[in-house]
Interface confidence: medium
């Protein structure tokens, strides 16, 4: 009977050992599967994040395109209206001009003498830029950078005058210290009678033949309304 009990005990031990080994294997398998699942979840999460990011970028890009499209459409609509009208009113800026505070600005990238620059602007139904405020000064300065650039101010006929008739004496000024240093000219026949923005934005008077860059300006018609989209 004792021998019988020992056999049964051995059998039970064997069964228990097998069960333990099997259970361990199953647990290991589950653990591996769990790891795989975790990895898969992580991978899915990062894929989802990437898709959300891409979608967000696409959305931003689309918004920009739509904004640009609307702007282009408005500009086109305005240009067409200008072409169809009698040309006396301007409701929007010409192509490649920059709109700011109900004025349009065009910034040259080459150089001309003051008179040639002045003529260029007139042929565009505009005038050399007339600076009437510190705010406008900063706007122009930002666009031209540190390069000598003509403005619509000269004293070729004696006193300093803005090309559009804006009063010089009471208006905004931003001369460099000691400038203008040739107030009434020096009888050279084209002396230092034309004003330009210097590399730091402040003004200097210079020989009008100098081949500087220039800025044209034209005012949007105050009375006209923005035309509706097509």
């Amino acid at each position: 009977q004792n021998a019988q009990l020992q056999r049964e005990l051995r059998g039970l031990r064997e069964t228990l050992s097998n069960f333990t080994a099997s259970t361990e294997a199953q647990v290991k398998g589950l653990s591996t599967q769990g790891g795989n699942v975790g990895r898969k979840m992580k991978s899915l999460e990062s894929q989802l994040e990437k898709q959300q990011k891409d979608l967000s970028e696409d959305h931003s890009s689309l918004l920009l395109h739509v904004k640009q499209f609307v702007s282009d459409l408005r500009s086109l609509s305005c240009q067409m209206a200008a072409l169809q009208g009698n040309g006396s009113e301007r409701a929007c800026c010409p192509v490649n001009w920059v709109e700011h505070e109900r004025s349009c600005y065009w910034f040259s990238r080459s150089g001309k003498a003051w008179a040639d620059a002045d003529n260029y602007c007139r042929l565009e139904d505009a005038h050399l830029v007339v600076v009437t405020s510190w705010e406008e000064q900063k706007f122009v300065q930002h666009h031209i950078g540190p390069v000598n650039t003509w403005m619509g101010l000269h004293d070729q006929n004696g006193p300093w005058k803005w090309v559009d008739g804006t009063d010089y004496e009471t208006g905004f000024k931003n001369w460099r210290p000691e400038q203008p240093d040739d107030w009434y000219g020096h009888g050279l026949g084209g002396g230092e009678d034309c004003a330009h923005f210097t590399d730091d934005g402040r003004w200097n008077d210079d020989v009008c033949q100098r081949p500087y860059r220039w800025v044209c300006e034209t005012e949007l018609d105050k009375a006209s309304q923005e035309p509706p989209l097509l």
Epitope: R109, S110, G111, A113, V147, N148, L188, G189, G190, G191, E192, D206, V207, Q209, R210, P211, Y212
Partner: antibody
Framework: QVQLVESGGGVVQPGRSLRLSCVAS????????MHWVRQAPGKGLEWVAV????????NYADSVKGRFTISRDNSKNTLYLQMNSLRAEDTAVYYC?????????????WGQGTTVTVSS | DIQMTQSPSSLSASVGDRVTITCRAS??????LAWFQQKPGKAPKSLIY???SLQSGVPSKFSGSRSGTDFSLTISSLQPEDFATYYC?????????FGPGTKVDIK
């Protein structure tokens, strides 16, 4: 130190082309206008062309207009002069020179020159 | 185009002499004038810019002045190394133009 070194000169037949180069070092090339000036044997200085710091404006002497092209590669600190339809009167030492400003203030630094001889 | 004339075309002087070269522009150029020195077989060297400003590294014996469209370069005390050809140049407008040069040689 600030240095300009020209190259590309040589003997060429009338009607042919030549390209001169000028390599700059010791200063921020992209901030300065650049000029080409030439000097025929036994003669004075003759301005040839200017290019602004950013390449946006180019001007030429009437004697080379339509035949010569000035250009620059700011990434390589190099100025070029492409010379086409060369004539005997283009024979000269060609100098590149730096403009102290963006391209309208003359010259402050000169290279040593490269000789171009146009002869059949 | 702006024409530049120089006088004299050549001059002979002795070491220690005070020498003045003049240059005239055919129209107003403000202060936009430079002076260069060139020795045989060498590149020009900048001496003066803006009519009267001394280029850095240039000795103070060189000076420039302007009266209207007339400009002058003065060497206060001529030294052996100063015998060369001197050119004026206007950069008031394109095309940039040079004077024909003044040759300074030993008397």
């Amino acid at each position: 130190q600030v240095q300009l070194v020209e190259s590309g000169g040589g003997v060429v037949q009338p009607g042919r082309s030549l390209r001169l180069s000028c390599v700059a070092s010791g200063f921020t090339f992209s901030s300065h206008g650049m000029h080409w000036v030439r000097q025929a044997p036994g003669k004075g200085l003759e301005w040839v062309a200017v290019i602004w710091y950013d390449g946006s404006n180019k001007n030429y002497a009437d004697s080379v207009k339509g035949r010569f092209t000035i250009s620059r590669d700011n990434s390589k600190n190099t100025l070029y002069l492409q010379m086409n339809s060369l004539r005997a009167e283009d024979t000269a030492v060609y100098y590149c020179a730096r403009d102290p400003s963006v391209g309208y203030d003359g010259m402050d630094v000169w290279g040593q020159g490269t000789t171009v001889t146009v002869s059949s | 185009d702006i024409q530049m004339t120089q006088s004299p075309s050549s001059l002979s002087a002795s070491v220690g002499d005070r020498v003045t070269i003049t240059c005239r522009a055919s129209q107003g150029i403000g202060n936009h004038l430079a002076w260069f020195q060139q020795k045989p077989g060498k590149a020009p060297k900048s001496l003066i810019y803006a009519a009267s400003s001394l280029q850095s590294g240039v000795p103070s014996k060189f000076s420039g002045s302007r009266s209207g469209t007339d400009f002058s370069l003065t060497i206060s005390s001529l030294q052996p190394e100063d015998f060369a050809t001197y050119y004026c140049q206007q950069y008031s407008n394109y095309p940039v133009t040079f004077g024909p040069g003044t040759k300074v040689d030993i008397k």
